[in-house]
Every structure is written in structure tokens, then in C-alpha cells.
Interface confidence: low
């Protein structure tokens, strides 16, 4: 902690100026009145502080503020900002966009994947549901941070905004981020023809359930084997030889060079050897000809 | 297919203005940022900007922040990039291009304002 | 504002020959959040405007050839032709979309022996 002493006369702070670049971590921790430091949040980023003096800013702001800093601080942190951890920052309370930005900006080539992701949470939770500008801004300067989101939060996005989400910007959802996504952008673009529908609802299609995947293998949209490899293993298992090739269109030859990898290995599996031929790749590991195929899941169900 | 047709070649006087305009086509026209990039004759590229057509809001190299004004017309699918105080060094050619996410997918074909009293 | 620094200037190929752009950040351009590196590779033809070849640095565009490839990550960056052909003559600018300004290199002027 820092040592407690009392300030020089000749060191009294009376603005957040350069001269207290001088100042050593005790003089700023005696001289520095924490409501002035608030008051003049915006100056503290255009001074040069070290790392150990922005430490002693940042206490002095947490004693002023235990439950919290108000998001006029917030909006001026700059690259105070680097010092927060996620503990502090579930404290906040932000729902402007410019904020936001702020910060993002701060944290660009810093380690701060947690911090970015707790903020982020904060505005979703003060802007009380993630609308069409969050995600604006969050595709504009944070790239792949949408998928930082929980799915609980992700569920507060309206179908309206979907429109907005960027390819990318899914890059690095997960499984249960997809399940939550992928209903609401079936949604947002279903007036679409089928050609448009599949390239607006590819990126998303990690939530696709086996139904709708059947669906667009009638469709002729020739799936790349990159979204078909991120496809739920659930609603790849059920989908026959001839679905899958209808599925994949000319792609259907890039199953070869993924045959040992998820989800590919488990279909093919599940299906049997002869059905598997009749594609020319050599696929092989399916159930042997003449074998009787009995789904026991089904038959506990019964029982 | 995607096009961006920019309006025709310019030439202004020092401490003029110019507006080149930028009409796209083959897409939906708020879905995507317009950039602006300019080319002096014989040198390399430089980002001015751009605007995010749907909510109008726009980010500006600092270079220009004081000099260029991005707007969009949404009736007429039509990106603008208005110029002010010009000089000499400014004689460009002045692309708006779509983004693809931030990198420059599509470009115009380009509008050569030239400056000279 | 990040400085992108390529190398060489200007680059004279054989035909059927490889070629090779180097491309420097003054920053790194990898976005840890999403493990992407926000830099892209533009093509200029003489009298045209530039074109796009690879973005996220190594994603090709759809309907460049596969002989262009973009590799690198952090700071530093590469462009390679497998084996150049005379349609590939021109200047060769790599940028950075990963932060505000996006900034591009100075270019690198690719001719044919």
C-alpha cells in the first residue's frame, strides 16, 4: 500500500497538470485530492505518468469511489483504464457509446481480454439489451468482442440488429453463443431468397439444428467444408450420405481430407460403408454391409 | 455485382472546395462502411476515412478532421466526401471504397481533383 | 499512428519465378481477443484502381489466384507470388484495419524482365 504522509506546502496540487509527472508515488498520494482528480479526469491521459503513478491515481479513485466510478471518470480513464481488472470494472455502471469507444481504443494491442469483455457486459447491462449501435460500435473497433458476450446477454439481442453482425465479428463464438444466435438471425433473414439467405445465415449456422441443416441441403447452396466443419455434431449425425452431398456440392471432396476430425469422423461412423462408397472418396470406418443397425436410444425411450 | 460510381474529374482553385460523390449498387448500401482513400500523382495510398451509412456516423484521419465532411444520402444509396480549404497538395485522386469488414473489398474507380490557380 | 513499412521498393521477376513482399508494423496488428491479424494486401494496376487480394492476413478474396498467399502475424508480414505472371505487374500496398487511421505501406512496385 502506499505510505501515508503529509503533503509539503510547496507540493499542494491545485490542477491535474504535467508538473506532477515530478512528483513521487507518496507526494502524489499526500497531495492529491481525489474529488480534484475526478473532477479533472480528462487532463491525466495528455501526462506521462509511469505505470507506478497511475497506480497511486487509481487508489485514490477506488477510495472516492468503493461502490464504483461514475461514468463521467469512466468516460475520461484513458489509459488508466489499463490498470483495471474485471473486479473493477463489474462495479460500473456505463451506457454510452462514447464510453465505450473510449476504451476500446485504450485497450487495443494491451492484454485485455477480460477487462474488454466485463466492459462490454457492463454497457450491454446498462443499455439494458444489446441494440443495433452497441453492436455498430463493437464490429467497428473490437472485432470478435460480440463473442466476449455470455449467452444470457447475447439473448438480448434483437433479430433487427442481427443484420449489423459481421462474419468476423463470430469468429470466436462458441457453441452456446451460436444456439442463442442462430434462431435470431434465421429470423432477421428469413424474407431472403435462398441464395442470400445462405450467405447471411452462414456465419451463424454453428446453432443450426439437424431440421434446418436437412433444409438447406435442398437448397443447392454448395456449403463450404469451413461451416460445415463448424456445424453442431448433433445436427451433423442424423443427416444421410445423400443429404450431406447435396449439402456440400462440390466441397463434398474436402470430407476426405477432414475424415478423422469431428464432426466428419462421427457421421461417418453412423453411416453405413456401402452408402459411403457410393461418394468415390474412400471414406471408410462406416458400419460393414449386412449389419443390423439398432439405435438404442430409441429402444430405452420405449422401455 | 457490387459498383461504385464516382463522379467525374474536378479542378478547383486553392481555398476552394470540392464534393465527389460515390453512388453504389448491386448491394444493400447500410449494411456496409464507405471508406475514403486518396492518391497523390505517382505516390502511395491514404485513408481519410469513413461513414457507417445506416446510423451516419463517421471517423476521420486526423490529417483532414478540420478539412473533410463525410455524408451519405440513403434515398439514392449515394456516399459524399466533401473537401474544404484546398491547396496545392490536395491535386488526388480520390477513391471511395465498401468495406468487406474493415479491409477495402470494393473500390470506385476513382475522381481526380486537381488544384491550381 | 501505426507506421507500415514495406520492403522492397520495386521488385523485377522472371516470369514463372516467385516473388516476395515484406510488410512491417510499427505495432503488432493481432487482435488477442479474436487471435486475427487485421492487415490486408491490395493490388494496383497500372491506370486502375487498387484491388483487394488477402485480408485477416492470409485470407485470400474470393477469385484471386491461389498462387498470391499472405502470411505473418504481429509485426510482421508477407506477400507471396508462387510464380508471376505479366497480368500481375503493379504496385502492391499492404494496410493495417486494425486501428484508427488504417494506414497503408508505400507500396511495392512489381515489373517484369
Known amino acids: 500500500d502506499v505510505e501515508r504522509t503529509t503533503c509539503p506546502p510547496e507540493k499542494e496540487v491545485h490542477e491535474i497538470d504535467e508538473s506532477l509527472i515530478f512528483y513521487k508515488k507518496r507526494e502524489l498520494e499526500a497531495c492529491v485530492d481525489a474529488a480534484l482528480l475526478a473532477a479533472q479526469m480528462d487532463r491525466v491521459d495528455a501526462i506521462p505518468f509511469t505505470y507506478e503513478q497511475l497506480d497511486v491515481l487509481k487508489h485514490k479513485l477506488d477510495e472516492l469511489y468503493p461502490q464504483g466510478y461514475p461514468e463521467s471518470v469512466i468516460r475520461h480513464l484513458g489509459h488508466l483504464f489499463l490498470k483495471m481488472s474485471p473486479e473493477d470494472i463489474r462495479k460500473w455502471n456505463v451506457t454510452s457509446l462514447e464510453t465505450l469507444k473510449a476504451l476500446l481504443k485504450v485497450s487495443k494491442g494491451h492484454e485485455m481480454s477480460a477487462q474488454v469483455a466485463t466492459l462490454i457486459d457492463r454497457v450491454v447491462v446498462g443499455r439494458g439489451q444489446l441494440d443495433k449501435d452497441t453492436v455498430d460500435t463493437l464490429t467497428a473497433f473490437c472485432p470478435g468482442c460480440l463473442c466476449s458476450l455470455s449467452p444470457e446477454r447475447l439473448s438480448s439481442v434483437p433479430p433487427s440488429v442481427i443484420g449489423a453482425v459481421r462474419p468476423q465479428d463470430l469468429d470466436t463464438c462458441g457453441p452456446r453463443q451460436l444456439d442463442v444466435l442462430y434462431p435470431k438471425a434465421r429470423l432477421a433473414f428469413q424474407n431472403m431468397s435462398g441464395s442470400e439467405y445462405f450467405v447471411k445465415i452462414r456465419p451463424f449456422l454453428g446453432g443450426a439444428p439437424t431440421e434446418d441443416v436437412k433444409a438447406l441441403s435442398q437448397q443447392n447452396v454448395s456449403m463450404d467444408l469451413a461451416t460445415f466443419m463448424k456445424l453442431r455434431r448433433e445436427a451433423v449425425l442424423p443427416l444421410t450420405v445423400a443429404e450431406v452431398q447435396k449439402l456440400l456440392g462440390p466441397h463434398v471432396e474436402g470430407l476426405k481430407v477432414e475424415e478423422q476430425h469431428s464432426p466428419v469422423r462421427d457421421w461417418i461412423l453412423k453411416q453405413r460403408q456401402d452408402d459411403l462408397d457410393t461418394l468415390g472418396l474412400g471414406l471408410q470406418g462406416g458400419i460393414p454391409n449386412g449389419y443390423l443397425i439398432l439405435d438404442l436410444s430409441v429402444r430405452e425411450a420405449l422401455s | 455485382e457490387v459498383q461504385l460510381v464516382q463522379s467525374g474529374a474536378e479542378v478547383k482553385k486553392p481555398g476552394a472546395s470540392v464534393k465527389v460523390s460515390c453512388k453504389a449498387s448491386g448491394y444493400t448500401f447500410t449494411n456496409y462502411w464507405m471508406h475514403w482513400v486518396r492518391q497523390a500523382p505517382g505516390q502511395g495510398l491514404e485513408w481519410m476515412g469513413n461513414?457507417?451509412?445506416?446510423?451516419?456516423?463517421?471517423y476521420y484521419n486526423e490529417r483532414f478532421m478540420s478539412r473533410v465532411t463525410m455524408t451519405v444520402d440513403k434515398s439514392t444509396s449515394t456516399a459524399y466526401m466533401e473537401l474544404s480549404s484546398l491547396r496545392s497538395e490536395d491535386t488526388a485522386v480520390y477513391y471511395c471504397?465498401?468495406?468487406?469488414?474493415?479491409?477495402?473489398?470494393?473500390w470506385g474507380q476513382g475522381t481526380l481533383v486537381t488544384v491550381s490557380s | 499512428d501505426i507506421v507500415m513499412t514495406q520492403t522492397p521498393l520495386s521488385l523485377s521477376v522472371t516470369p514463372g519465378q516467385p516473388a516476395s513482399i515484406s510488410c512491417k508494423s510499427s505495432?503488432?496488428?493481432?487482435?488477442?481477443?479474436?487471435?486475427?491479424?487485421?492487415l490486408a494486401w491490395y493490388q494496383q494496376k497500372p491506370g486502375q484502381s487498387p484491388t483487394l487480394l488477402v485480408y485477416f492476413a492470409s485470407t485470400r478474396e474470393s477469385g484471386v489466384p491461389d498462387r498470391f498467399s499472405g502470411s505473418g502475424s504481429g509485426t510482421d508480414f508477407t506477400l507471396k507470388i508462387s510464380r508471376v505472371e505479366a497480368e500481375d505487374v503493379g504496385v502492391y500496398y499492404c494496410q493495417q484495419h486494425y486501428r484508427t487511421p488504417y494506414t497503408f505501406g508505400g507500396g511495392t512496385k512489381v515489373e517484369i524482365k
Open positions: 461513414i457507417n451509412p445506416s446510423s451516419g456516423d463517421s
Open positions: 471504397a465498401r468495406s468487406g469488414g474493415l479491409w477495402l473489398a470494393f
Open positions: 505495432q503488432t496488428l493481432l487482435n488477442s481477443v479474436s487471435q486475427n491479424n487485421y
